[in-house]
């Protein structure tokens, strides 16, 4: 996961005239015994917000010890501070832990800025807010690292909920998830509402804050409005969607849908902003900067460099457009969209000058690995990550930040042709053309 | 035209704080940005701090000043001030009130076309 922080181009794609409506196959999906319903001891179980992650507590070990371990979507590593570190109030040690296995064996994760290495073994694992189980899970019980731990964040370790394909150092490493479905009756299903602050919080308030919630086996109806809708995960490796077109204030970018997914989009809460490749970074930020008075802030600002400030109270939220993502949908030629506010891209940061301002910082970045639906999208919606039926849901949340004028929204269905064409294809290293 | 005055500046010691005042006369409707900037001895002039009224007054600072100056306007004095909080000696220098119409980013201090003539404000130790 990025925390934050060439192709073969179809040409005149763009789906059809968007007025054109499919009709709902259905209005709701089917029941499923154990997946959807109220799930009252697991609301309200994260806590921390977007700028440093979204934590859950953990147990590990016998007698259990507790911790708060960072619930990232964008990796496949369950791994957390074994060792002291100045960042960390509390660490996992093993030597106390009586049904701690080793597994005599390391593993070393570099990001593009800092890293992890450590120690793998297995020990009992339960969530306290969660399902009320106990699972043997892989643990990475990380002895060095480098940037990787966040002062203030409040959380010592990372849970990777994405799949095996992408866990270090291969994917014979069972993930947290994969075990948890394998050992016990839990669906193969998880569903998060991240909720942003909308407003600067300080270490105390952070502290008593409540982040949202990770429905760990299903869905939980009071935590969205509307309906759920869903998009196929093209590959199950991170969680990969594909964006099929975007609009600004309802302005289609007219790009090759190919760029939107360039090398490949993927719903991570493990990162902060909504990151885009560079070409659409570009045309989106000419978009947003041409349907508002901003065209004149300073480079360092769209950069996300420079800080915006307002008098408090005072945020001209209509100034800035909003922001249309479309995204495949489970029927054939049928595409969603998914529109986040500037309250979710403008990101509140504390301003240290004074409490008479509000200050922000644009939350939306340029990737060299593709599209990132980091927490800023993630926090307008209740997001479903249904693995059994390879599909995420989206709905509005119900907690997401808005006006009396503009709330984020999930419609469809749209007409949208050919929409397969919108995914990138990775070149794969075929190994036998590599022999000699 | 549009004419700036400054005032307001002054010497503190270290920690302490001082509040500077830019009065602004005549097309001052057609500026889509105010900036504060400042001048060192033997130094290039640097923007601090821009206001942009045409964006209901969205506030900029530079980095070596974040945190510690807020700008400000009163619309209806035609007035932005620059409230500068623990002030330090490297803080010393002539600031400028500055207005502009054209299409520059804020932070070029090239991109201003109307100036003030300045006042000096020194921070001792």
């Known amino acids: 996961t990025q925390h934050g922080i060439r192709l073969p181009l179809r040409s005149g794609l763009g789906g059809a005239p968007l007025g054109l409506r499919l009709p709902r196959e259905t209005d709701e999906e089917p029941e499923e015994p154990g997946r959807r319903g109220s799930f009252v001891e697991m609301v309200d179980n994260l806590r921390g917000k977007s700028g440093q992650g979204y934590y859950v507590e953990m147990t590990v070990g016998s007698p259990p010890q507790t911790l708060n371990i960072l619930v990232d979507t964008g990796s496949s590593n369950f791994a957390v501070g074994a060792a002291p570190h100045p960042f960390l109030h509390r660490y996992y040690q093993r030597q106390l832990s009586s049904t701690y296995r080793d597994l005599r064996k390391g593993v070393y994760v570099p990001y593009t800025q800092g890293k992890w290495e450590g120690e793998l073994g297995t020990d009992l694992v339960s969530i306290p807010h969660g399902p009320n189980v106990t699972v043997r899970a892989n643990i990475a019980a990380i002895t060095e690292s480098d940037k990787f731990f966040i002062n203030g964040s409040n959380w010592e370790g990372i849970l990777g909920l994405a799949y095996a394909e992408i866990a270090r150092p291969d994917d014979s490493l069972e993930p947290f998830f994969d075990s948890l479905v394998k050992q016990t009756h839990v669906p193969n299903l998880f569903s998060l509402q991240l909720c942003g602050a909308g407003f600067p919080l300080n270490q105390s308030e952070v502290l008593a804050s409540v982040g949202g919630s990770m429905i760990i086996g299903g869905i939980d109806h009071s935590l969205y409005t509307g309906s759920l809708w869903y998009t196929p995960i093209r590959r199950e490796w991170y969680y990969e969607v594909i964006i099929v077109r975007v609009e600004i204030n309802g302005q289609d970018l007219k790009m090759d849908c190919k760029e939107y997914n360039y090398d490949k989009s993927i719903v991570d809460s493990g990162t902060t902003n909504l990151r885009l490749p560079k070409k659409v970074f570009e045309a989106a930020v000419k978009s947003i900067k041409a349907a508002s008075s901003t065209e004149k802030f300073p480079d360092g600002f769209w950069l996300g460099e420079q800080l915006v400030c307002w008098q408090a109270g005072t945020t001209p939220w209509n100034i800035f457009p909003v922001i249309s993502l479309y995204l495949m949908g489970e029927v054939t030629n049928q595409s969603f969209r998914i529109t986040i506010l500037p309250q979710q891209y403008l990101r509140p940061v504390e301003d240290v000058a004074t409490s008479q301002d509000d200050c922000y910082k644009f939350a939306i970045s340029q990737s060299s690995t593709g599209t990132v639906m980091g927490a800023v999208i993630m926090e307008g919606f209740y997001v479903v990550f249904d693995r059994a039926r390879k599909r995420i849901g989206f709905a509005v949340s119900a907690c997401h930040v808005h006006d009396e004028f503009r709330t984020a929204a999930v419609e469809g269905p749209f007409v949208t042709l050919d929409m397969e064409d919108c995914g990138y294809n990775i070149p794969q290293t075929d190994e036998s053309t590599l022999m000699t | 035209d549009v004419q700036l005055q400054e005032s307001g500046g002054g010497s503190v010691q270290a920690g302490g704080s001082l509040r500077l005042s830019c009065a602004a006369s005549g097309y001052t409707s057609e500026m889509n940005r105010f900036a504060w900037l400042r001048q060192a001895p033997g130094k290039d002039r640097e923007v601090v701090a821009v206001?942009?009224?045409?964006?209901?007054?969205?506030?900029f600072y530079s980095d070596s000043v974040n945190g510690r100056f807020t700008i400000s306007q009163d619309t209806a004095k035609n007035t932005v001030y620059l409230q500068m909080n623990s002030l330090e000696p490297e803080d010393t220098a002539m600031y400028f009130c500055?207005?502009?119409?054209?299409?520059?980013?804020?932070?070029?201090?090239?991109?201003?076309?109307?100036w003030g003539q300045g006042t000096q404000v020194t921070v001792s130790s």
């Open positions: 206001i942009f009224p045409t964006a209901r007054g969205a506030k």
């Open positions: 500055a207005a502009s119409a054209n299409a520059m980013t804020g932070f070029q201090p090239s991109g201003y076309t109307y």
